[in-house]
Interface confidence: medium
């Protein structure tokens, strides 16, 4: 019969003939012959393969790099590579997260709408009216003025979105 | 100079308390976001929780959430960490530290102070 030019899915065309592809987790030792099937052997403990293939070596899974501020999100298996994330209060710099940024810090008259997470950077906000924040920080929300009414004081000076109000003694003199 | 001090360490039964101080100079503590962050034997770093300057905003990692509480008096510079119903896991050097915005993770940290939980 003729040699085959093309071949199933899941097989490859090697001398002439379809061999059976290696399954996800597993990495080719030898081809086919007309005699013999493929040859596989499961990748080792640290690495992995995640498609049907012909691949003489198995890929290593990646290293979350500590230093560079990653820790592991999902340990890899024989078919799937790890997944890594940043530290709390980092995010990934990229889809792939090949390493961390920290997450910024809001301005004065900013707050934190949302903390980082491993995959976004702080969220700020404008501190709207009633509400101020008076430092730079990744954690500090808006806090809304001192209340001088409940505390029997009066306004001495108005609040801005970056001070408090100051409050103070109510004038006896009245008319 | 920079210098944090941590305090407070020891060794303790599982379920019982301590509480870590940390004392801060030689920068704004009142304006500066603070942490905690644990080093258990044989293990690398772990973030524990941050304060923001004012100590209006607290958070947890997941593992101390509920059992831990970190605050700060400024007028003291001077950083806290609160540990009830301590457990094995719990065992580690921790470091009180500035946070710094560019990574290594912290820019200035304390020495550290050991928490053993044992029986």
């Known amino acids: 019969p003729e040699p085959p030019t093309a071949c199933r899915e899941k097989q490859y065309l090697i001398n002439s003939q379809c061999c059976s592809l290696c399954q996800p987790g597993q990495k080719l030792v030898s081809d086919c012959t007309e005699f013999t099937e493929t040859e596989c052997l499961p990748c080792g403990e640290s690495e992995f393969l995640d498609t049907w293939n012909r691949e003489t070596h198995c890929h290593q899974h990646k290293y979350c790099d500590p230093n560079l501020g990653l820790r592991v999100q999902q340990k890899g298996t024989s078919e799937t590579d790890t997944i890594c994330t940043c530290e709390e209060g980092w995010h990934c710099t990229s889809e792939a997260c090949e390493s961390c940024v920290l997450h910024r810090s809001c301005s004065p008259g900013f707050g934190v709408k949302q903390i980082a997470t491993g995959v976004s950077d702080t969220i700020c906000e404008p501190c709207p009216v009633g509400f101020f924040s008076n430092v730079s920080s990744a954690f500090e929300k808006c806090h809304p003025w001192t209340s001088c009414e409940t505390k029997d004081l009066v306004v001495q000076q108005a609040g801005t979105n970056k001070t408090d109000v100051v409050c103070g003694p109510q004038d006896r003199l009245r008319a | 100079e920079v210098q944090l001090l941590e305090s407070g360490g020891g060794l303790v039964q599982p379920g019982g308390s301590l509480r870590l101080s940390c004392a801060a100079s030689g920068f704004t503590f009142y304006a500066s976001d603070m942490k905690w962050v644990r080093q258990a034997p044989g293990k690398g770093l772990e973030w524990v929780s941050s304060?923001?300057?004012?100590?209006?905003?607290?958070y947890y990692a997941d593992s101390v959430k509920g059992r831990f509480t970190i605050s700060r008096d400024n007028s003291k510079n001077t950083l806290y960490l609160q540990m009830n119903s301590l457990r094995a896991e719990d065992t580690a050097v921790y470091y009180c530290?500035?946070?710094?915005?560019?990574?290594?993770?912290?820019?200035?940290w304390g020495q550290g102070t050991l928490v053993t939980v044992s029986s």
């Open positions: 530290a500035k946070a710094d915005y560019t990574y290594h993770s912290f820019d200035y």
């Open positions: 304060i923001s300057p004012n100590g209006w905003d607290t």
